[in-house]
């Protein structure tokens, strides 16, 4: 009996009120392998989520998320609101970054500057919340009397070193 | 999966320096925040400070300013905390932990096994 | 500076519900989430809710959380205690998104 349902194709199920018989799936429903005893329910892009590629009966709908946001997880099974670039997402939604950390993206967290001394180097072009930090040559590297490009450093939150 | 594994315990003399490691792997260690919380014998978790191993930049907890540097070697996947200037009010256990890309405020995913600091003379 | 204040110690019996608070002192306790982590003596940390009230996987639904805003705080509830819950239990928020700040931790025991 067993080798009966291993002859169902993909898109069909293994029929046990039917003498086992391959019967098709059901209206939003399929099965992607062979031999199965039941068809899987089509997932449904709904709310935030919008339909990438439609249901067959041998493979699931794939869903995308609507505009001003974007996918995360496996196969897309969440979706995140986007930010504006110089922002990060919290609880409470969309916030500017802290002082000392840029998100040049529309999604994901915002990181520290760059510290450019890790590498010997000073702060050519100050850091923004949506740019990092340029770093430049160290001041060593300048040539005696020529002025150094470092800019100031801007005042730090208290407890933090992002340069 | 995801591994973040610590050095060894270590005993250390009053006014010395201790630098722990944290051997990341089973993910991309650049894109993810490495934090440094200690735990006093009997006592809660304490925040010491984090780096993003993408690029060295560091933040550290007001307390620790000046005492703790942090840096991550690319190459190995591993972070490193190094902690001058030690009392006795340092011994601690140390962990690292992994805050996910989720959201600015998240929780730490994963945990190192936690290295104990003793400083004693 | 902000600070999240938890009961120093609690007990209940097995089978039994606890609830675990954590205040916050100043600023509104829904700007930031809530994430609860256990720990075993000798043991690391782990996270049992994360998001102030997600469970991650292989946690069981024993384990609930919530987000008061009218008392300002947030809870860690079990329910059907068993003797193997007993630990430390810490919550976990922010007071910016590079500064995590943690309560002090409350001693769960499960009374024999």
């Known amino acids: 009996l067993q080798d009966l349902c291993s002859n169902c194709p993909a898109g069909t199920f293994c029929d046990n009120n039917r003498s086992q018989i391959c019967s098709p799936c059901p209206p939003n429903s399929f099965s992607s392998a062979g031999g199965q005893r039941t068809c899987d329910i089509c997932r449904q892009c709904k709310g935030v989520f919008k339909t990438r590629k439609e249901c067959s009966s041998t493979s699931n709908a794939e869903c995308d998320c609507i505009s001003g946001y974007h996918c995360l997880g496996a196969e897309c099974s969440m979706c995140e609101q986007d930010c504006k670039q110089g922002q990060e997402l919290t609880k409470k939604g969309c916030k500017d970054c802290c002082f000392g950390t840029f998100n040049d993206q529309k999604r994901g967290i915002c990181r520290p500057w760059t510290n450019c001394s890790l590498d010997g180097k000073s702060v050519l072009v100050n850091g923004t919340k949506e740019r990092d930090v340029v770093c430049g040559p160290s001041p060593a590297d300048l040539s005696p009397g020529a002025s150094s490009a470092t800019p100031p450093a801007p005042a730090r939150e208290p407890g933090h070193s992002p340069q | 999966e995801v591994q973040l594994v610590q050095s060894g315990a270590e005993v250390k003399k009053p006014g010395s320096s201790v630098k722990v490691s944290c051997k990341a792997s089973?993910?991309?260690?650049?894109?993810?925040?490495i934090y440094w919380v200690r735990q006093a014998p009997g006592q809660g978790l304490e925040w010491i400070g984090n780096?993003?191993?993408?690029?060295?930049?560091?933040f550290y907890g007001e307390k620790f300013m000046g005492r703790a540097t942090f840096t991550a070697d690319t190459s190995t996947s591993t972070a490193y905390m190094e902690l001058s200037s030690l009392r006795s009010e340092d011994t601690a256990v140390y962990y690292c932990?992994?805050?996910?890309?989720?959201?600015?405020?998240?929780?730490?995913?994963?945990w190192g096994q936690g290295t104990l600091v003793t400083v004693s003379s | 500076n902000v600070m999240l204040t938890q009961p120093h110690s609690v007990s209940e019996s097995p089978g039994k519900t606890v609830t675990i608070s954590c205040k916050l002192n100043?600023?509104?306790?829904?700007?930031?989430?809530v994430h609860w982590y256990q720990q075993r003596p000798g043991s690391s940390p782990t996270t049992m809710i994360y998001?102030?009230?997600?469970?991650p996987d292989g946690v069981p639904d024993r384990f609930s959380g919530s987000i008061d805003s009218s008392s300002n705080s947030a809870s860690l509830t079990i329910s059907g205690l068993k003797t193997e819950d007993e630990a430390d239990y810490y919550c976990?928020?922010?007071?910016?998104?590079?500064?995590?700040?943690f309560g002090g931790g409350t001693k769960l025991t499960v009374l024999g």
């Open positions: 998001r102030d009230d997600k469970r």
């Open positions: 780096i993003w191993p993408g690029n060295g930049g560091t």
């Open positions: 932990a992994r805050r996910p890309d989720y959201s600015g405020d998240d929780y730490f995913d994963y």
């Open positions: 976990h928020s922010y007071d910016s998104t590079i500064t995590p700040v």
């Open positions: 089973g993910y991309t260690f650049t894109s993810y925040y």
């Open positions: 100043s600023g509104n306790i829904g700007s930031y989430y």
